[in-house]
């Protein structure tokens, strides 16, 4: 097993939204849980959009999982990721 | 280390209203997390009521959402619960807790207040 | 709301010996689950979170599992401060909703 390196990242979308992205790498197996929670739950899937699961070339895998949110309420938002037993959670950088 | 303590009238007459304070120690409220009020009945049920967040945000039990009322006051770090119209059926102990937001489970809890609806 | 079923409601058992308490929700809620221990006079206080996840100074005889609907919490050789009631809650969506408590009894 490899555990993922998860990283988040922001970037401008319309006047007043982020888009705040969750990237899964180097992971082995490639089954994985990738979501974003808004205040501590699951957000609604249709408010999210992922990649698909792709080999990086390595021997291991990539993905990642989107969502458009309000500026000013990034702390209301976390990256939950689970893979082959363990879990994080990861916070939208300021 | 965050510290929570309620406090309120242990004894409400039915039709009248519940209110309640938490003080908050150790964290401030508006910093970050969901300040939650949870409450037990004598049968031990547990029922989430509702939360306000360290921006003001509110987020209540569709249960209650006509009765219920989460307030805070930031210069003494502490939120309040407001219950209209109470009956027998909301005598219950009260916790107040809070939750990160990496998710909604509840890491510490207040001692609890025993609060009783009678005539 | 999804509704959580716990059992057994009760259950007594001897120190040294094994237990599992279950938890069922209505519908999926993908790990996204909190088991609490409470003893009389006392709060709730957090053992597990995303179903799996031992809190804080829990000790090792605790273990939990489960996924989809399907959730259980398991005391390997029961110590006598193990003794009172256990509570799953959900935290998949609102309102977050709690079972109806195990009580684990000395035998």
């Known amino acids: 097993t490899v555990p993922p390196m998860v990283n988040v990242t922001r970037s401008e979308a319309s006047e007043g939204n982020i888009t705040v992205t969750c990237r899964a790498s180097s992971f082995y197996p490639r089954n994985i849980i990738l979501t974003w929670r808004q205040d501590g739950v699951s957000l609604s899937a249709d408010t999210q959009q992922w990649g698909d699961v792709l080999p990086d070339g390595n021997g291991t895998y990539q993905t990642w999982v989107a969502t458009r949110i309000c500026r000013g309420e990034e702390q209301r938002f976390t990256c939950y990721m689970e893979h082959s037993g363990n879990h994080s959670t990861h916070p939208v950088p300021s | 280390d965050v510290q929570l303590q309620e406090s309120g009238p242990g004894l409400v007459k039915p039709s009248q209203s519940l209110s309640l304070t938490c003080t908050v120690t150790?964290?401030?409220?508006?910093?970050?997390?969901?300040w939650n009020w949870i409450r037990q009945f004598p049968r031990n049920k547990l029922e989430w009521m509702g939360y306000?967040?360290?921006?003001?945000?509110?987020n209540y039990n569709p249960s209650l959402k006509s009765r219920i009322s989460i307030t805070r006051d930031t210069s003494k770090n502490q939120f309040f619960l407001q219950l209209i119209s109470v009956t027998t059926e909301d005598t219950a102990t009260y916790y107040c807790?809070?939750?990160?937001?990496?998710?909604?489970?509840?890491?510490?809890w207040g001692q609890g207040t025993l609060v009783t609806v009678s005539a | 709301d999804i509704q959580m079923t716990q059992s057994p409601a009760s259950l007594s058992a001897s120190v040294g010996e094994t237990v599992t308490i279950t938890c069922r929700a209505s519908?999926?809620?993908?790990?996204?689950l909190a088991w609490y221990q409470q003893k009389q006079g006392k709060s709730p206080q957090l053992l597990v979170y995303?179903?799996?996840m031992l809190a804080d100074g829990v000790p090792s005889r605790f273990s939990a599992s489960g996924s989809g609907t399907q959730y259980s919490l398991k005391i390997n050789s029961l110590q006598p401060e193990d003794f009172g009631s256990y509570y799953c809650?959900?935290?998949?969506?609102?309102?977050?909703?709690f079972g109806a408590g195990t009580k684990v009894e000395i035998k």
């Open positions: 807790s809070y939750y990160r937001y990496d998710g909604a489970w509840f890491p510490y």
């Open positions: 150790g964290y401030s409220i508006t910093s970050d997390y969901a």
């Open positions: 306000i967040n360290y921006s003001g945000t509110t």
């Open positions: 519908g999926n809620i993908h790990n996204y």
């Open positions: 995303n179903a799996i």
């Open positions: 809650q959900h935290f998949w969506s609102f309102p977050l909703t």
